[in-house]
């Protein structure tokens, strides 16, 4: 499911449950995706020893995964709501090609991988409604994405395992940073 399920049964029974605000909806959506990533990471870590590899060893890759930097305005020092929101949306749009790559990488968690991808699309829509400066958001070039996807899929098994692990780890870090920043707004 692209959107987290409704409140559990005991919550539904609660009288006068108020609808979620825009902030609550975004927060919940990010947490839903992070739970999905957690499940995917579990399968990846059970399948290969990538999770034991040091951060330094894994950093030696030429994947251009989105990452938060000081200039993006999403950290405590130099926090800027508008700049940060643009960075979060741009970053999520850039992650989409990597999430597409993940689609054929899981056996028992195939549905979970699809849910993470679809939920991210929904999250982007929620955030775009919140952003005032949509002009500053650059959408990745589809042709570039298509060739990147082909290149990633042509890697040997070991590199594909590492790529999967790196995407999940980077996406988790990006979303956690986004969650913290959005809660400050």
């Amino acid at each position: 499911a692209p959107v987290p399920p409704g409140e559990d049964s005991k919550d539904v029974a609660a009288p006068h449950r108020q609808p979620l605000t825009s902030s609550e909806r975004i927060d919940k959506q990010i947490r839903y995706i992070l739970d999905g990533i957690s499940a995917l990471r579990k399968e990846t870590c059970n399948k290969s020893n990538m999770c034991e590899s040091s951060k330094e060893a894994l950093a030696e890759n030429n994947l251009n995964l989105p990452k938060m930097a000081e200039k993006d305005g999403c950290f405590q020092s130099g926090f800027n709501e508008e700049t940060c929101l643009v960075k979060i949306i741009t970053g999520l749009l850039e992650f989409e090609v990597y999430l597409e790559y993940l689609q054929n990488r899981f056996e028992s968690s195939e549905e979970q991988a699809r849910a993470v991808q679809m939920s991210t699309k929904v999250l982007i829509q929620f955030l775009q409604k919140k952003a005032k400066n949509l002009d500053a958001i650059t959408t990745p070039d589809p042709t570039t994405n298509a060739s990147l996807l082909t290149k990633l899929q042509a890697q040997n098994q070991w590199l594909q395992d590492m790529t999967t692990h790196l995407i999940l780890r980077s996406f988790k870090e990006f979303l956690q940073s986004s969650l913290r920043a959005l809660r400050q707004m």
Epitope: K28, L34, D35, F79, Q176, R180, L182, R183, Q184
Partner: antibody, heavy 117, light 107 residues
Framework: VKLQESGGGLVQPGGSRKLSCAAS????????MHWVRQAPEKGLEWVAY????????YYADTVKGRFTISRDNPKNTLFLQMTSLRSEDTAMYYC???????????WGQGTSVTVSS | DIQLTQSPASLSASVGETVTITCRAS??????LAWYQQKQGKSPQLLVY???TLADGVPSRFSGSGSGTQYSLKINSLQPEDFGSYYC?????????FGGGTKLEIK
């Protein structure tokens, strides 16, 4: 860093009260803020949170629809407007500063609210 | 809602001892967890956030660890000033609930 709550006192059930928290010693507008309460001889209960720009606001289910958290950044003040008060709202109310991760790194001394007829 | 279960509810220990307090969440809270100390009649004080990051000015005898649903606070070589109540709190999904608390008393 100093946080000073005020506005507590004795209130009738169904009544209203507005608590204030005066902040000093830090740039107030750069931090999210929380209200937390503690009933006599009981544990801590998170009440509400407000982001630095007030666009992110969260409440505990027990106070949603009755309490309103707000802030005045130029005046370095946090507020908690409480309405439809019940006896179970009797507690010491603390304001606390949120660090970047949401945890409460500085707390006020608290202001006591008693709801009783 | 995520529930936090702290254990033990109370414990007695002597100065110099090592104690561990645990906090179990009803769901994965992804390390979005803090620990506080509160002394009788005083405001709480932050000890640890992000499950394992020590807050500024907190002595190194305190340490936090854990992941997923299981977290703990360890106090090495208890000092007289360490006695009081300890609470865990999560920041995963609202409401950002506290655990029920652990009262640490001098034996």
């Amino acid at each position: 860093v100093k946080l000073q709550e005020s506005g507590g006192g004795l209130v009738q059930p169904g009544g209203s009260r507005k608590l204030s928290c005066a902040a000093s010693g830090f740039t107030f507008s750069r931090f999210g803020m929380h209200w937390v309460r503690q009933a006599p001889e009981k544990g801590l209960e998170w009440v509400a949170y407000i982001g630095r720009g007030s666009s992110t606001i969260y409440y505990a289910d027990t106070v949603k629809g009755r309490f309103t958290i707000s802030r005045d950044n130029p005046k370095n003040t946090l507020f908690l407007q409480m309405t439809s008060l019940r006896s179970e709202d009797t507690a010491m109310y603390y304001c606390a500063r949120s660090n970047w991760d949401g945890a409460m790194d500085y707390w006020g001394q608290g202001t006591s609210v008693t709801v009783s007829s | 809602d995520i529930q936090l279960t702290q254990s033990p509810a109370s414990l007695s220990a002597s100065v110099g001892e090592t104690v561990t307090i645990t906090c179990r969440a009803s769901g994965n809270i992804h390390n979005f967890l803090a620990w506080y100390q509160q002394k009788q009649g005083k405001s709480p004080q932050l000890l640890v956030y992000n499950a394992e990051t020590l807050a500024d000015g907190v002595p190194s005898r305190f340490s936090g660890s854990g992941s997923g649903t299981q977290y703990s606070l360890k106090i090495n070589s208890l000092q007289p000033e360490d006695f009081g109540s300890y609470y865990c709190q999560h920041f995963w999904s609202t409401p950002w609930t506290f655990g029920g608390g652990t009262k640490l008393e001098i034996k």
